[in-house]
Interface confidence: medium
């Protein structure tokens, strides 16, 4: 979690925030937190509320994707008078409350980040004692997960007329640039497909016609690193098969 900027449309920061006699509901979250895959990231969330000295039962919730309706990834509950928020849900055991809801802090830590965690998260607090009230961040915090390239698949496939084509699929954020090298190729970007819908971190490059036997190498590179993998083409000349 690298860069964080405050969302001024959602964060009503002012010097009277702790002393105002009639505090309104507000939530302070940064619009974006950036972190690298494998790291732990913290999603900050603090709030103000109009119920002075509220000490009743409360529930802290984080959801992903969209406010109010997105799936919950974390939930904890604190009993009346208790500062301990007992975890009731932590998706895959990777979400942990760092803030103290009694101190108006719902900050959450996400462990072992993966590219799939790259989405928007929304914090919510619910009061359920003498006071029944709730509030949820509307804009949320976008967790931007970056990752060095990783080649997830490289293969040689038959194509019409006894020809062969090579496919290389890599993931990373920023989406990696792919390049093929091989016999009589030099260094070719080949036919690079845009990231697929629903697979925004995956990029595929195709070599439509492999004309020579030998080793074909796919290289994926972005600002965080590079990765390469190779596939071998050896055709049994005079036969229709190939060994890869």
């Amino acid at each position: 979690f690298v860069r964080t900027k405050i969302d001024t449309t959602e964060n009503l920061l002012n010097t009277e925030v702790h002393s105002s006699p009639a505090q309104r509901w507000s939530m302070q979250v940064p619009p974006e937190v950036s972190a690298e895959a494998g790291d732990a990231a913290v999603l900050p969330c603090t709030f103000t509320h109009p119920h002075r000295h509220y000490d009743g039962p409360l529930t802290a919730i984080w959801r992903a994707g969209e406010p109010y309706a997105g799936p919950q990834v974390f939930r904890c509950a604190a009993a009346r008078g208790s500062e301990l928020c007992q975890t009731a849900l932590s998706l895959h055991g990777r979400f942990r409350l760092l803030g103290n809801p009694r101190r108006n802090d719902l900050s959450l830590r996400v462990e072992r980040l993966a590219l799939a965690d790259d989405r928007r998260y929304f914090c919510r607090v619910e009061f359920a004692g003498d006071v029944h009230d709730r509030y949820e961040s509307r804009h949320g915090v976008r967790l931007h997960v970056t990752a060095a390239p990783r080649i997830v698949n490289i293969s040689v496939l038959p194509s019409p007329a006894h020809a062969f084509r090579a496919l290389c699929t890599a993931e990373g954020e920023p989406p990696p640039a792919l390049a093929w090298s091989g016999p009589a190729l030099g260094n070719s970007l080949a036919a690079v497909r845009s990231p697929r819908e629903g697979h925004g971190h995956l990029v595929t490059a195709e070599l439509p016609a492999l004309t020579h036997d030998g080793r074909y190498t796919c290289t994926a590179a972005n600002s965080l690193g590079r990765s390469e993998a190779s596939v071998y083409l050896f055709r049994f000349h005079g036969a229709s098969g190939a060994s890869t």
């Epitope: 405050i6 900050p44 830590r109």
Partner: antibody, heavy 123, light 107 residues
Framework: QVQLQESGPGLVKPSETLSLTCTVS????????VHWVRQPPGKGLEWIVL???????TYNSALKSRVTISKDTSKNQVSLKLSSVTAADTAVYYC?????????????????WGQGTLVTVSS | DIQMTQSPSSLSASVGDRVTITCKAS??????LAWYQQKPGKAPKLLIS???SLETGVPSRFSGSGSGTDYTFTISSLQPEDIATYYC?????????FGGGTKVEIK
């Protein structure tokens, strides 16, 4: 009482790997995180990395490609490795305790510090 | 990254004077600010967290205030033992960043 002590070679050659150890006492690495911070001579402070109580890590992205942090809870030690060093890595390196690791607030402060160890990068 | 701009970089004051140091963040940091004191040849010492909360054992002449992007550290009555460099640090956003420091000397 809480104490942290950095140790390691005071001189490292350019392009080599700097290795430092922080030995702690008065608290358990199972319950507290540890930061590494450095300070070039006559300059300000630069945060490097935090290892949380459960072993998770959070790095300064500007240094992450060269930094490795690990810990041995049973030995009360946290180690830092910085690869491919240059003269710009000459600094006093501090380890410091992260005080609110376990559910009392996301406060990235450093409440206890070691005395620091000077590492000079020179051939 | 959030930049922390501290001023002045150095100051000289008399014993008993009121000393004020300011720290400006390049973006809102929601009061998640700490102040440290570093005496020559020593490690930094945490004085204040949460922009205003004095750490246990820190003399009450030290105080902090501010909100949003602008924060202030005050020594109400400078003492000889306060000769040091003072740093602010934000922890709202990783990477954690420090101000450039303010060196306080006695006239």
């Amino acid at each position: 009482q809480v104490q942290l002590q950095e140790s390691g070679p005071g001189l490292v050659k350019p392009s080599e790997t700097l290795s430092l150890t922080c030995t702690v006492s008065g608290f358990s690495l199972s319950n507290y995180g540890v930061h590494w911070v450095r300070q070039p001579p006559g300059k300000g402070l630069e945060w490097i990395v935090l290892i949380w109580s459960d072993g998770s890590t959070t790095y300064n992205s500007a240094l992450k490609s060269r930094v490795t942090i690990s810990k041995d809870t049973s030995k009360n030690q946290v180690s830092l490795k910085l690869s491919s060093v240059t003269a710009a890595d000459t600094a006093v390196y501090y380890c410091a305790r992260h005080p609110y690791d376990d559910y009392s607030g996301y406060y990235y402060t450093m409440d206890y510090w070691g005395q620091g160890t000077l590492v000079t990068v020179s051939s | 990254d959030i930049q922390m701009t501290q001023s002045p970089s150095s100051l000289s004051a008399s014993v008993g004077d009121r000393v004020t140091i300011t720290c400006k963040a390049s973006d809102h940091i929601n009061n998640w600010l700490a102040w440290y004191q570093q005496k020559p040849g020593k490690a930094p010492k945490l004085l204040i967290s949460g922009a205003t909360s004095l750490e246990t054992g820190v003399p009450s002449r030290f105080s902090g205030s501010g909100s949003g992007t602008d924060y202030t550290f005050t020594i109400s009555s400078l003492q000889p033992e306060d000769i040091a460099t003072y740093y602010c640090q934000q922890y709202w956003s990783s990477p954690l960043t420090f101000g450039g420091g303010t060196k306080v000397e006695i006239k």
